[in-house]
């Protein structure tokens, strides 16, 4: 079934942008001016998820790349990765659970909770130039709040 999708960029609550760091990793750093063109453009899709009062299930792909953020266990720890998919089959309404994030909007801020690992969130570090990761704490040192910006084609 077709899905509703949009193109956007994400910045953490400290205004750090997300950029590629090697072929399968994202990092967060402050960008200005023309460097803003380096930031990753996501294709965010509305997918099927578990019933909830106000969490909206989404998948986060990299625009025009066959890569999706996914959550898997590595060394017994929930881990965020970029995973290659067959572009002929994605995005789809019934995404595998590892690709699904519960988008939570509070006061114009977004959180992305792993559907596979409840209470684990897409996170960035306070420090510059560090990998984007899956974190198991909210409200601590690590940043779990993001803002979204539509991308004009």
């Amino acid at each position: 079934a077709p899905v509703r999708s949009l193109n956007c960029t994400l910045r953490d609550s400290q205004q750090k942008s997300l950029v590629m760091s090697g072929p399968y990793e994202l990092k967060a750093l402050h960008l200005q001016g023309q460097d803003m063109e380096q930031q990753v453009v996501f294709s965010m899709s509305f997918v099927q998820g578990e019933e909830s009062n106000d969490k909206i299930p989404v998948a986060l792909g990299l625009k025009e790349k066959n890569l999706y953020l996914s959550c898997v266990l590595k060394d017994d720890k929930p881990t965020l990765q970029l995973e290659s998919v067959d572009p002929k089959n994605y995005p789809k309404k019934k995404m595998e659970k590892r690709f699904v994030f519960n988008k939570i909007e509070i006061n114009n801020k977004l959180e992305f909770e792993s559907a596979q690992f409840p209470n684990w969130y897409i996170s960035t570090s306070q420090a510059e130039n560090m990998p984007v990761f899956l974190g198991g704490t909210k409200g601590g040192q690590d940043i779990t709040d993001f803002t979204m910006q539509f991308v004009s084609s």
Epitope: V3, S5, N7, C8, E51, I56, K103, T147, Q149, F150
Partner: antibody, heavy 119, light 108 residues
């Protein structure tokens, strides 16, 4: 004050075109999803379509090909271009803001603008 | 495409009555359903989203329930301000966002 104001409605002949505008104040359209919903006189609500970023628009099956939604973020305005208009397109046209991205429901509505298609 | 069917189409009731309006989806939409109230000449007002969550500022006499394909809107004790037309809306079943045909609530 957060509000939406539609404009551009009026009388148009069958086969004609019209462009409706919806201007937002009190918030930025740069991260808001905006929909158009219409209501024929004495009838129910009918979803027309929705725009996210400028490349991501979705339409009711009956609206595809004749109706186009666009946005101008610098003017904080969303548009509905309507072509090949028919008598059955006569309706009040509302723009509305999606409550949250992909929530599919609409918490902020404009006052509506009446489009009459008649010769 | 998912079709939303409301019943009844019209409903006469008195102040203080308990009122129930039902909405049926042609296939399962989980809890992706909203309810709106509309008064003549006015824009619709969101009452309930995700089947059962009350929108901001909506009185607690309104409640929603259901999941899958069957949903209800209940007004526990009808007030004079509640006479209006009510619409259900599928908000999450695929690309399209479909409304029910409406239920007009009138004074008995």
């Amino acid at each position: 004050e957060v509000q939406l104001v539609e404009s551009g409605g009026g009388l148009v002949q069958p086969g004609g075109s019209l462009r409706l505008s919806c201007t937002a104040s009190g918030f930025s359209l740069s991260d808001a999803a905006m929909a158009w919903v219409r209501q024929a006189p004495g009838k129910g609500l009918e979803w027309v379509g929705i725009i996210y970023d400028s490349a991501s628009t979705y339409y009711a099956s009956w609206a595809k090909g004749r109706f186009t939604i666009s946005r101008d973020t610098s003017k904080n305005t969303v548009y509905l271009q309507m072509n090949s208009l028919r008598a059955e397109d006569t309706a009040v046209y509302y723009c509305a803001r999606e409550r949250q991205i992909f929530s599919g429901d609409f918490v902020l509505w404009g006052q509506g603008t009446l489009v009459t298609v008649s010769s | 495409e998912i079709v939303m069917t409301q019943s009844p189409s019209t409903l006469s009731a008195s102040v203080g009555d308990r009122v129930i309006i039902t909405c049926q989806a042609s296939q399962s939409i989980d809890n992706w359903l909203s309810w709106y109230q509309q008064k003549p000449g006015k824009a619709p007002k969101l009452l309930i989203y995700r089947a059962s969550t009350l929108a901001s500022g909506v009185p607690s006499r309104f409640s929603g329930s259901g999941s899958g394909a069957e949903f209800t809107l209940t007004i526990s004790s009808l007030q004079p301000d509640d006479f209006a037309t009510y619409y259900c809306q599928n908000t999450g079943g695929g690309i399209n966002i479909a409304f029910g045909q409406g239920t007009k609530l009138t004074v008995k």
